[in-house]
Structure formats: C-alpha cells, structure tokens
C-alpha cells in the first residue's frame, strides 16, 4: 500500500497546537515515529506520514518530484517524492535533486562547463527516439538555480520554475523548456482532466497567478466536454 511504501515526505509542516491559532505555518522537521509538538499545556503528537498529492512537479517542493510511489501505481495517485541524489537512477531531470540532471538514467552533477552540451544532447536523443515521449524529457525540467546568479527572464531556457524570475514559470516549448509568464485573469489556461495529459503538450502554459484558478468560462458551459474553454478566474 502507499502507506508502507512511502516515507519520503515525513512531517511536512506541523499543525498548530490544539486550541492554538490556526493559519500559522508550521516548521518542517525530519522523520520520526511520532513527533511531539506543544499543544496547550501538554504535548500532542502527529503521525510522521503526510503524503502530498500532485499532478505536476511544480506542485511539489524544489527538492521533490511528482510521481506514483509504486511501480504499478495506486489507481492514479501521484504524490511528491524526495528527489534523487547524485548517482541514483532517474527517468527525467525532475527526479534529480537541484544541481543535478538525468543523463542515461542516472542523476549526474549539472557541471557548468559540460551541462549545456549534455542537456542539448539529451533533448536530441529524447526527441529523436520513438520510444521516448516528450514527457520522458520531463515536466519539471529547469536549470539548477545554483548555476546562475540571476533568475531567467521570459524566453530563457530553464529546468525548474525556481530558475525563472518572479511572475514567470518554467514550461515546455517544443522540446525544451523556457520561462513563460504566469497567467493573468481572463487568460486561457489548461485544466488537465486526465492524469498525465500534460505530457502531450508541446506548448505548455503556466499556471494561473495568485488568487486565480483555472475554471470553465461561464458562457462555455453548454459546449461539449472536449471544446470547453478554461480561463483564469478570481476565486
């Protein structure tokens, strides 16, 4: 089961003490069988297993990637998993921890001098190989932020959204990924109905900006499921 397979996301953020103020961010702590945290006059405990469901790598932390925790998968459940360190097996760049990328199925260091040539080589291999879809190249593929002193501007090549400047996200454009603007109110957005459908996008859109969500445009409710237009709308 998922519970027994996973432990990478132990204690994400702690809840507030019972009876304490809600809405205050907790602090991340490492895994333990049960964590004690102050609760009123005594200590309360929280289970250390807090799976975080996701559909895209961007929903996870920078040190995580989104995938099914078991090989067979649990009927469509994808959750954030801890990134793979150097020399660990991988299938796409997003699986490797920041400062690394996936080359020939192994996470290797994003050495500044060799990185760009190898990445281009990897893209060419992926694109020219019938067996590897664009999604094999990755959903969260952006250059490690450690490689650059400045954040990527619109149109810059990236591996992760954290490589892009504020207001931009890292999205697929043909067979590479570039920094694109986060969507504004009224702009057309993509609502992924089927798990993994984002892998088919050659021109991927960013997500909706702060305070917006991707919803069916009101005058398109009568349209057929396939032609429904989604736009970024205020909550």
């Amino acid at each position: 089961t998922l519970n027994s397979v996973l432990n990478s996301n132990a204690i994400k953020n702690l809840p507030p003490p019972l009876g304490g103020a809600a809405g205050h961010p907790g602090s991340a702590v490492s895994a333990a069988p049960g964590i004690l945290y102050p609760g009123g006059n005594k200590y309360q405990t929280i289970d250390n297993y807090q799976p975080y469901p996701c559909a895209e790598d961007e929903e996870c932390g920078t040190d995580e990637y989104c995938a099914s925790p078991t090989r067979g998968g649990d009927a469509g459940v994808q959750i954030c998993l801890a990134c793979r360190k150097r020399r660990k097996r991988c299938m796409r760049h997003a699986m490797c921890c920041p400062g690394n990328y996936c080359k020939n199925g192994i996470c290797v260091s994003s050495d500044q001098n060799h990185f760009r040539g190898e990445i281009e080589e990897t893209i060419t291999e992926s694109f020219g190989n019938d067996h590897s879809t664009l999604d094999g190249y990755s959903r969260r593929t952006t250059l490690s932020s450690k490689m650059y002193h400045t954040k990527g501007q619109e149109g810059s090549v990236c591996l992760r959204s954290s490589d892009c400047a504020s207001g931009l996200c890292c999205a697929r454009h043909f067979w590479s990924k570039i920094c694109k603007p986060v969507l504004k109110e009224g702009q057309v957005c993509t609502k992924h109905r089927r798990k993994g459908s984002h892998g088919l996008e050659i021109f991927q859109r960013c997500y909706c900006g702060e305070g917006l969500s991707c919803r069916i445009q009101k005058d398109h409710h009568q349209a057929s499921n396939s032609s429904r237009l989604h736009t970024c709308q205020r909550h």
Epitope: P25, A28, Y52, C54, A55, E56, G167
Partner: nanobody, 125 residues
C-alpha cells in the same frame, strides 16, 4: 489573517454518513493541496485524505478507502470530506489543512502550512 473553519461534525450512528466542510478565508495566496487529518484520543494525528491542486490526484488512507470521498471547490476555497459507512473507529477530531503559497513561491518540501481548529466526529455503535 488566514482562517480555516471546519463544520459538519457531530454525533452519528455506525453506518451513518456525515459531510465535513472546510472554508479557507483571508490571505492572498494560491491554495495547492488540501487535506483532512484526524486525531483520536491518545493517538497520533493521522492523514485521512488529500487532494492535489488540480483535483486529479487524490490520496486516501487505507482505513477509509471506499467509504470517504474528498473533493474541493476552488471558487469557494472549500474542501469537503464525505464520510459514509461510518465506524466507531472513525471517532476523532477532524482537521483540515491546506498548502497556501504566494505567487511563484515554491518551498523545498511541499507541505500543509495552514490548519483549522478541528471538528468533532463521534460515531456511536
């Protein structure tokens, strides 16, 4: 001030149903994953169910699979937990939790950073 307010808890007989709601208010951030946790007296707080930002990936604890259903309404900034075929072992305080992020913000590890005060669910046999 961000607030998460749960409602829908109460006393129900075994085999009965309840629907919990949690409304997120205040703060200007995007709500990513949303989840329900529970804590029975003398036990650890445990996850019950969680739903991804787009709603396409949903996690359920083994103990509630097939009985509980989580859903979300982003327009209302609300997460729901439909609980059917309730058992006495489902008795606990139920908490909702969300991951609220400012535009473009991305933590090292994704997690639930805003929590409600909880609503009591008691299942009598």
């Amino acid at each position: 001030e961000v607030q998460l307010v749960e409602s829908g808890g109460g006393l129900v007989q075994a085999g009965g149903s309840l629907r919990l709601s949690c409304v997120v208010s205040g703060g200007t951030f995007s709500v990513y994953a949303m989840g329900w946790f529970r804590q029975a007296p003398g036990k650890l707080r445990e996850i019950v169910a969680a739903i991804s930002r787009t709603g396409s990936s949903i996690y359920y604890a083994d103990s509630v699979k097939g009985r509980f259903t989580i859903s979300r309404d982003d327009a209302k900034k609300t997460v729901y937990l439909q609980m059917n075929s309730l058992k006495s072992e489902d008795t606990a305080v139920y908490y909702c939790a969300v991951d609220g992020r400012a535009n473009g913000e991305r933590p090292a590890v994704a997690g639930y950073n805003y929590w409600g005060q909880g609503t009591q669910v008691t299942v009598s046999s």
